[in-house]
């Protein structure tokens, strides 16, 4: 069977530029090592936002300078992207790869449209 990945269609970032969503995958095999990548698609260009490889049952570890954090529970990954601004509004795709043990499987979600609205600056108080 091919691997299916589900993620919400739309998420609104908080006023602090933080967006969270769940990426859930239907694993066809008993993977012990999983790689999760967040991709951003804009104007048909796809770029990598962040990636993490984790052992099942352990925490997701993104690079120290990553704008992503996450936790895993079974076949669910809870992803949080920080530091978002209005210009970062776009389609964020969850990509899941079952790396080990073989066989390798790829799963790509349909994407979550994240809307980011920059907060209005506070008016000067006299």
């Amino acid at each position: 069977k091919a691997m299916h990945v589900a993620q919400p269609a739309v998420v609104l970032a908080s006023s602090r530029g933080i967006a969270s969503f769940v990426c859930e995958y239907a694993s066809p095999g008993k993977a012990t090592e999983v790689r999760v990548t967040v991709l951003r698609q804009a104007d048909s260009q796809v770029t990598e936002v962040c990636a993490a490889t984790y052992m099942m049952g352990n925490e997701l570890t993104f690079l120290d300078d990553s704008i992503c954090t996450g936790t895993s529970s079974g076949n669910q990954v809870n992803l949080t992207i920080q530091g978002l601004r209005a210009m970062d509004t776009g389609l964020y795709i969850c990509k899941v790869e079952l790396m080990y043990p073989p066989p390798y499987y790829l799963g790509i979600g349909n994407g979550t449209q994240i809307y980011v609205i920059d907060p209005e600056p506070c008016p000067d108080s006299d």
Epitope: K1, A2, M3, H4, P28, R35, T37, L39, V46, T47, E48, A51, T53, I93, K95, E97, M99, Y100, P102, P103, Y104, Y105, L106, G107, I108
Partner: antibody, heavy 118, light 107 residues
């Protein structure tokens, strides 16, 4: 600009070895899975091997298992295919290809011809 | 192993005509299907990925459709440069497999 350039092909006798190289440029090499695909003269495309983000994670086609070894040197942005115990049926053009962010093979090298003949 | 079957083996058409190429998988591959074009002496060139998304720089006369196990590549109006061999590929699981190809030649 993404570029993949294969080298190392040539004529070799059955049972001998050959090492192919693929020099990559224009992208962050270590962030991508890299593949070898071959094409026998007048035939279709056959996937040979892949090496993932960790150099220890590899997969091979049945026809390559036990004889071919894929490796990468991220510091040199280079992909390799060590081919041992070569047979006449290994005669083909060997392409390296990048596994794109969305999974399909988005960039290919120009290929290098390997001829196994006595 | 997922086996891909392409039909027809050869398609003889004239420039300006519509080409319809078929690819069938031995089991469901969701949307992890790509199409490549190859001309003699050249490397394959990606045309379509994810069943229906065009790769960078591919003209809109190329389109892909299908789901599950049955997929189609359509070239709405053949241009002289479109006469080539077309391969489908599944990339959703190991081992990655290609179809045997369909040759589109000039009638």
């Amino acid at each position: 600009e993404v570029q993949l350039v294969e080298s190392g092909g040539g004529v070799v006798e059955p049972g001998r070895s050959l090492r192919l190289s693929c020099a990559a440029s224009g992208f962050t090499f270590s962030s991508y899975g890299m593949h070898w695909v071959r094409q026998a003269p007048g035939k279709g495309l056959e996937w040979v091997a892949v090496i993932w983000y960790k150099p220890s994670e590899k997969d091979y086609a049945d026809s390559a298992k036990g004889r071919f070894t894929i490796s990468r040197d991220n510091s040199k942005n280079t992909l390799y295919l060590q081919m041992n115990s070569l047979r006449a049926e290994d005669t083909a053009v060997y392409y390296c290809a990048r596994g794109g962010l969305l999974g399909y093979f988005d960039y290919w090298g120009q290929g290098t011809l390997v001829t196994v003949s006595s | 192993e997922i086996v891909l079957t392409q039909s027809p083996g050869t398609l003889s058409l004239s420039p300006g005509e519509r080409a319809t190429l078929s690819c069938r998988a031995s089991q469901s591959i969701n949307s992890y299907l790509a199409w490549y074009q190859q001309k003699p002496g050249q490397a394959p060139r990606p045309l379509i990925y994810g069943v229906s998304s065009r790769a960078t720089g591919i003209p809109d006369r190329f389109s892909g459709s299908g789901s599950g196990t049955d997929f189609t590549l359509t070239i709405s109006r053949l241009e002289p440069e479109d006469f080539a061999v077309y391969y489908c590929q599944q990339y959703g699981r190991y081992p990655f497999t290609f179809g045997p190809g369909t040759k589109v030649d000039i009638k």
